[in-house]
């Protein structure tokens, strides 16, 4: 699986999850998030050669098409597969609130 | 929606579904498919500027991150959203078989 366990341990050029730390205030302009100050959102990148973690029949077909037609511009792309939520603390005035934000952290990637 | 209705009618540079005809024999080397000879598989391509058909909170956050950090290499990618099946006819010996292959045709795209 093209997940953090594999990708963060290997120098993988092809489609894999990459570490990306986002600081809420500096990178997004979000002053309203109290904790954490930032988090590892991660992202997916790298080429999708034929059959690399293909998501659907279409991406498999497209990968094969590219292999046999190297000049083609149509190719699968490396995108998030598994995402996890992030729990944040923010304040409504003086009142603390805890919220779980869905689909905030990329854990693995696929070729789609 | 970044679907064939919209994308095939507009000269859209950003993420959109593009027409791609695949000839089973010539492009894939599949001699076993009798009918059709080929089909419009289509594909997704084009930049994913901030908030263009963002798929998840992560892709929205990543888009915002890119807007505020233009030098960043992490950005959402244009990939298939809705896929449709394709019905094919092939022969097992002299016996015709009809099969529906799932997820063969891209109908719309998203930024993921």
């Amino acid at each position: 699986a093209l997940d953090t366990n594999y990708c963060f341990r290997n120098l993988e050029e092809n489609c894999c999850v990459r570490p990306l730390y986002i600081d809420f205030r500096q990178d997004l302009g979000w002053k309203w998030v109290h904790e954490p100050k930032g988090y590892y959102a991660n992202f997916c990148s790298g080429p999708c050669p034929y059959l690399r973690s293909a998501d659907t029949t279409h991406s498999t077909v497209l990968g094969l098409y590219n292999t046999l037609n190297p000049e083609a511009s149509a190719s699968p792309c490396c995108v998030p597969q598994d995402l996890e939520p992030l729990t944040i603390l923010y304040y409504v005035g003086r009142t603390p609130k805890v919220e779980q934000l869905s689909n905030m952290v990329v854990k693995s990637c696929k070729c789609s | 929606a970044l679907d064939t209705n919209y994308c095939f009618r507009n000269l859209e540079e950003n993420c959109c579904v593009r027409p791609l005809y695949i000839d089973f024999r010539q492009d894939l080397g599949w001699k076993w498919v009798h009918e059709p000879k080929g089909y419009y598989a289509n594909f997704c391509s084009g930049p994913c500027p901030y908030l263009r058909s963002a798929d998840t909170t992560h892709s929205t956050v990543l888009g915002l991150y890119n807007t505020l950090n233009p030098e960043a290499s992490a950005s959402p990618c244009c990939v298939p959203q809705d896929l449709e099946p394709l019905t094919i006819l092939y022969y097992v010996g002299r016996t015709p078989k009809v099969e529906q292959l799932s997820n063969m045709v891209v109908k719309s795209c998203k930024c993921s």
């Epitope: 997004l28 302009g29 979000w30 309203w32 304040y91 005035g93 919220e99 | -």
Partner: antibody, heavy 120, light 108 residues
């Protein structure tokens, strides 16, 4: 230059519905919490509710809870106020505002306002 | 909800004079959850002071805010003709956000 421009105000009958829009420009729309504030003719200011960007967490004043919905289209840099089951006492100028940064905060930019009149 | 009471309701002064506007909260707001706005007829409110004492960008130095707990003050050191308007205080310590009923500053 930051600008907020409201539209959609109208004369509507009690129990009717209306949707107000607020187009923002001059800043990164998805970085700030946005609020609606209203002002009845000749009266003071009343907070209506807020929405947090991207995650779309919203909260409302008791007077409008269950009837009004705040949403935003980040791609269009637009804030909306959907008003249902309107009452005569909802008659006011409605202002779209940007907060300084926190969820509850001072409001550093205001639109010009749009008038909603609820009358039979 | 937190009730804000502004006084006086109307303040009649002449240009050049010092204006002192009061805002009292029904419960303590701490030291930094109060803002002041100015509103002229037919216009939207304009933020003057936030965090009880911080001036918003572009606000002249003659405007100053002070106070903590339940008692807050907006002071205009020397009134200019364009300062005559209605002034509102706003608390954002607790939900819902509330505003005072306003103080009308008029030319004497």
């Amino acid at each position: 230059e930051v600008q907020l421009v409201e539209s959609g105000g109208d004369l509507v009958k009690p129990a009717g519905s209306l949707r107000l829009s607020c187009v923002a420009s001059g800043y990164t729309f998805s970085s700030n919490v946005m609020s609606w504030v209203r002002q009845a003719p000749g009266k003071g200011l009343q907070w209506v509710g807020y929405v947090i960007p991207i995650v779309d967490i919203a909260n409302y004043a008791d007077a409008v809870k269950g009837r009004f919905t705040i949403s935003r289209d980040n791609a269009k840099n637009t804030l909306y106020l959907q008003m249902n089951s309107l009452r005569v006492e909802d008659t006011a100028v409605y202002y779209c505002t940007r907060t300084l940064g926190l969820v509850l905060d001072a409001m550093d930019y205001w639109g010009q306002g749009t008038l909603v009149t609820v009358s039979s | 909800e937190t009730v804000l009471t502004q006084s006086p309701g109307t303040l009649s002064l002449s240009p050049g004079e010092r204006a002192t506007l009061s805002c009292r909260a029904s419960q303590s707001l701490g030291s930094s959850y109060l803002a002041w706005y100015q509103q002229k007829p037919g216009q939207a409110p304009r933020l003057l002071i936030y965090g009880a004492s911080s001036r918003a960008p572009g606000v002249p130095a003659r405007f100053s805010g002070s106070g903590s707990g339940t008692d807050f003050t907006l002071t205009i050191s020397s009134l200019e003709p364009e300062d005559f308007a209605v002034y509102y205080c706003q608390q954002y310590a607790d939900s819902p956000i509330t505003f005072g009923q306003g103080t009308k500053l008029e030319i004497k």
